[in-house]
Amino acid sequence: VPPGEDSKDVAAPHRQPLTSSERIDKQIRYILDGISALRKETCNKSNMCESSKEALAENNLNLPKMAEKDGCFQSGFNEETCLVKIITGLLEFEVYLEYLQNRFESSEEQARAVQMSTKVLIQFLQKKAKNLDAITTPDPTTNASLLTKLQAQNQWLQDMTTHLILRSFKEFLQSSLRALRQM
């Protein structure tokens, strides 16, 4: 131990420590609760949650989605392919979570918590992944211009974008949760 430092171990008591799978499960449920809180504000503020014009705005967004080829569904389940898809998808969602940061008045802290807890989840999952080379990180320049483009939209489109991000992120996490429980 270097001078000026003190190292003290924490000994585990009789209670079983959390496993990697349990902790990841809890982290996803934590984020899902956060999304519910944010969706509540979005739905109270506008009528986006009942809107039928979603397809209009969805064309502008390239939100990550689970597909059959990703190996996360029961048919054709592939643990390694699926884990890569989950991590890649979460990394792609990060720019959209950044966009959400200025979109909430009364839930500003909750939006930040959703963003940060997603970063934590990515870390947990990266520890679990064997094939980190297969994970492509989004290009920062592309993300920056996407963010600028999203922030330049009119108010209605911004509200719709917020609603769609939250809905897609929720669906992606729910699919991830189901898949991870099979691993």
Partner: nanobody
């Protein structure tokens, strides 16, 4: 070991490592107990969103951080005062796993399941 005597105004970094489980899965708190006094919560850091909390008595002087790669949590203590003299403990718990948890609750002993054995810090000239 490692704690010991520090002069007023001095600095010390305490580190908390875990044996037998993954520290980054838990909310971590630092507590201290001065002779004849109750154990008090000093600072804590969440495992869910890395948010931090500090007791008023240490705000601006102490910094809590985690290094998940090293499975270690640190408490950097600057501008130490004689009243910081105490036995310091780190603890791990699951107080932060419910979204919307009350951050200030993390300095309550009851929120923790795992405790370190403590280290003496004495601030004196």
């Amino acid at each position: 070991g490692g704690g010991g005597l520090v002069q007023p105004g001095g600095s010390l970094r305490l580190s908390c490592a875990a044996s037998g489980f993954t520290l980054d899965y838990y909310g971590i708190g630092w507590f201290r107990q001065a002779p004849g006094k109750e154990r008090e919560g000093v600072s804590c850091i969440s495992s869910s969103d890395w948010s931090t909390y500090y007791a008023d008595s240490v705000k601006g002087r102490f910094t809590i951080s985690r290094d998940n790669a090293k499975n270690t949590v640190y408490l950097q203590m600057n501008s130490l005062k004689p009243e910081d003299t105490a036995v310091y403990y780190c603890a791990a718990g699951t107080w932060d796993l419910k979204f919307g948890y009350n951050r200030s609750n993390c300095v309550r002993s009851a929120e923790y399941d795992y405790w370190g054995q403590g280290t003496q810090v004495t601030v004196s000239s």
